[in-house]
């Protein structure tokens, strides 16, 4: 059964997923998708990393932690009720049937209060590591659509970032974790 995580409408949701790289910088590809983990890949992929970097993401989805140290926890910005559901974190360990997969259930609750406006910050400055994408799009149209419309001034609030980083520490022990090597 899926581990359940909760967030309120308008907040950033946090879905923990971790692995321990065999050696520093020896990264393993990871994908995140909407929907339970299928036999391969991550259903409708919303974000993925390769051996070096985040190489595909869609708007509102990012990695707030240090993915180079194995923190591949997913942050979903400014969630709505439509973001409820199961998400898949898949750690694509090379070899014969070595993948580790985790299903995480996100429950979105209506907001209790309307949050006051907060200062905005440039997405590129906050997350410079995410400025790489796969070199070409899909040969045919996939269910998810084509490459995301990447807006380099996507907004993230300082308050949400601070809360997410505290939450990351709180949930590290309860999140999906796998040691490699």
């Amino acid at each position: 059964s899926e581990v359940e995580y909760r967030a309120e409408v308008g907040q950033n949701a946090y879905l923990p997923c971790f692995y321990t790289p065999a050696a520093p910088g020896n990264l393993v590809p990871v994908c995140w998708g909407k929907g339970a983990c299928p036999v391969f890949e991550c259903g409708n992929v919303v974000l993925r990393t390769d051996e070096r970097d985040v190489n595909y993401w869609t708007s509102r989805y990012w990695l707030n932690g240090d993915f180079r140290k194995g923190d591949v926890s997913l942050t979903i910005e400014n969630v709505t009720l439509a973001d409820s559901g199961i998400y898949c974190c898949r750690i694509q360990i090379p070899g014969i049937m070595n993948d580790e997969k985790f299903n995480l259930k996100l429950v979105i609750k209506p907001a209790k209060v309307t949050p006051a406006p907060t200062r905005q910050r440039d997405f590129t400055a906050a997350f410079p590591r995410m400025l790489t994408t796969r070199g070409h799009g899909p040969a045919e149209t996939q269910t998810l659509g084509s490459l995301p419309d990447i807006n380099l001034t996507q907004i993230s609030t300082l308050a949400n970032e601070l809360r997410d980083s505290r939450l990351a520490n709180d949930l590290r022990d309860s999140g999906a974790t796998i040691r490699i090597g």
């Epitope: 994908c31 998708g33 929907g35 339970a36 299928p38 036999v39 391969f40 890949e41 991550c42 259903g43 409708n44 992929v45 595909y56 694509q92 360990i93 090379p94 070899g95 014969i96 049937m97 070595n98 993948d99 796969r134 070409h136 899909p138 040969a139 045919e140 996939q142 269910t143 998810l144």
Partner: antibody
Framework: EVKLVESGGGLVQPGGSLRLSCAAS????????MAWVRQAPGKGLEWVAN????????YYLDSLKSRFTISRDNAKNSLYLQMNSLKAEDTAVYYC???????????????WGQGTLVTVSS | DIQMTQSPSSLSASVGDRVTITCRAS??????LAWYQQKPGKAPQLLVY???TLAEGVPSRFSGSGSGTDFTLTISSLQPEDFATYYC?????????FGQGTKLEIK
Amino acid sequence: EVKLVESGGGLVQPGGSLRLSCAASGFTFSDYYMAWVRQAPGKGLEWVANINYDGSSTYYLDSLKSRFTISRDNAKNSLYLQMNSLKAEDTAVYYCARDVGYYGGNYGFAYWGQGTLVTVSS
Amino acid sequence: DIQMTQSPSSLSASVGDRVTITCRASDNIYSYLAWYQQKPGKAPQLLVYNAKTLAEGVPSRFSGSGSGTDFTLTISSLQPEDFATYYCQQHYGSPLTFGQGTKLEIK
């Protein structure tokens, strides 16, 4: 136009080996998982193996993984199946099929080759 | 392993009939189900993926539905070229597994 063309089938004695090939064209080969599926004469479909985009991860039917090896060469747009220690029950038409793509979403074998017949008999 | 059970195993129908084939999974496979059509001596052809999405080029008389463990393939008005064998297949658990097939014959 997407095309998958298998080759390498034929008659082989029990205990022998064969290497099947599948030449792919009409799509970005390295963007897709690829698979082998087989069908014994008059029987249903049976999945054999899958391989991820760059060949670093492979997946097999448990009963076959000690004898069969799936691999790919993205530079040549080719998929392979090395079959060792063949048995009479491995007799089947072997199909190469394109599986899920880099962005997920479409879970089904969208394109198939015409198949190549492997007959294991003495 | 996830077992896929199709029913019926064979079916006789006439051109113009509405036909439904069912597929039951032994475990929850969410919507990771595909349907294929196969004619004698030919490779299978994908009809439906993700339980209900029609593959490119497939006539709209075909439709898929269901999620979890119970799925159906419906042909709203049979055409002469639809007489073939139909297979369901799950993409949720390893190993990937197919149903045993449903042979659709002319009445």
